[in-house]
Amino acid sequence: EPPTACREKQYLINSQCCSLCQPGQKLVSDCTEFTETECLPCGESEFLDTWNRETHCHQHKYCDPNLGLRVQQKGTSETDTICTCEEGWHCTSEACESCVLHRSCSPGFGVKQIATGVSDTICEPCPVGFFSNVSSAFEKCHPWTSCETKDLVVQQAGTNKTDVVCGPQDRLRA
């Protein structure tokens, strides 16, 4: 009686169970009553990562530098290439199929959290008493200079984009 289901790592074809090809190999011909399944290794830059009956191996993923990608781990006949972002770039999603440059925080904003390979820069507005006068992906908001500790007085108030300007105390005060 012909089988209706096959064991693990087998597949049903022409009323008989044939062995699947192991990872790293593709199917050349199905088994017969007299012959085993014929498999062939995947070629250079190709892979198959499961027990399979595929007649073509998959091409290794291309880590496109135009999308900010580089090779993190080179593929084998059994595994795909793993891509990651270039330094200074981050993934557009968890799957990391493309990358974009980290955002810079504009003047008046400081870096709350430095970007990683999977998350962008997080900026925050500089609160009163702090400033940032540069566009940067690294710089936090800096505190205004304390004129008093230098025995000076504030001559020009600070903003979220500028530091205070200190000057000498007016010695002519009554």
């Epitope: 990562d49 073509h56 998959h58 091409q59 993923k61 135009n66 999308l67 900010g68 795909d80 557009t92 999603s93 968890e94 799957a95 199929e97 493309s98 974009v100 440059l101 980290h102 955002r103």
Partner: antibody
């Protein structure tokens, strides 16, 4: 050869649910995501959503409540389900290789008409 | 919600003309922008990735520029096969994956 191909009904009645299938070959769904994009006749492309190579699904904010995107890596298929279809949903529906990325590989598209 | 505004929506030009199409994002998307060309009855064809990098097999008369919120596609010398509709697409994140409204390039 790397291909993606859409299949499903060409005619859907208003209020019905649309189910479209994207069948891929030449690449693994564990390595690449697949997105769905539609184009109403004579109008612009609209990104509906996609599924990443890690299985994460993403949806356009305006379509989130009506869409489900799922996949079967063994069957090499990605399925789009869109509920409560309306005549304004009449469009050519494309699947393309890639999740949140650019789309270098597109299917030929399938025209879905919503009419009673 | 995030938007991509493409302009003009259509333009008429002659073979040999220099053509410029712009795309403006409602918030910064770094250089996460692509450009496509679409001809009637066909799926779009990828032209530019990363705002300025030519996709494989695309003629060098096409170029892209911009970063942040403002982007441009330029065709330096329009050829007969370039009459088509062009779309920009952002891919900075899942919440900002959107296509522009398209620009139809017609024969003058």
């Amino acid at each position: 050869e790397v291909t993606v191909k859409e299949s499903g009904p060409v005619l859907v009645k208003p209020t019905e649910t649309l189910t479209l299938t994207c069948t891929v070959s030449g690449f693994s769904l564990s390595s690449y995501g697949v997105s769905w994009i539609r184009q109403p006749p004579g109008k612009a492309l609209e990104w509906l959503g996609g599924i990443g190579s890690d299985g994460s699904a993403y949806y356009a904010s305006w379509a989130k409540s009506r869409l489900t995107i799922s996949r079967d890596t063994n069957l090499k298929q990605v399925v789009l389900t869109m509920t409560n279809m309306d005549p304004v949903d009449t469009a050519t529906y494309y699947c393309a290789r890639g999740g949140i990325t650019v789309y270098a590989m597109w299917g030929q598209g399938t025209l879905v008409t919503v009419s009673s | 919600a995030f938007q991509l505004t493409q302009s003009p929506s259509s333009l008429s030009a002659s073979v040999g003309d220099r053509v410029t199409i712009t795309c403006q994002a409602s918030q910064s998307i770094s250089q996460g922008l692509a450009w496509y060309q679409q001809k009637p009855g066909k799926p779009p064809k990828l032209l530019i990735v990363g705002a300025s990098n030519l996709a494989s097999g695309v003629p060098s008369r096409f170029s892209g520029s911009g970063s942040g919120t403002d982007f441009t596609l330029t065709i330096s010398s329009l050829q007969p096969e370039d009459f088509a509709t062009y779309y920009c697409q952002s891919y900075f994140s899942s919440s900002s994956t959107v296509f522009g409204g398209g620009t139809k390039v017609e024969i003058k």
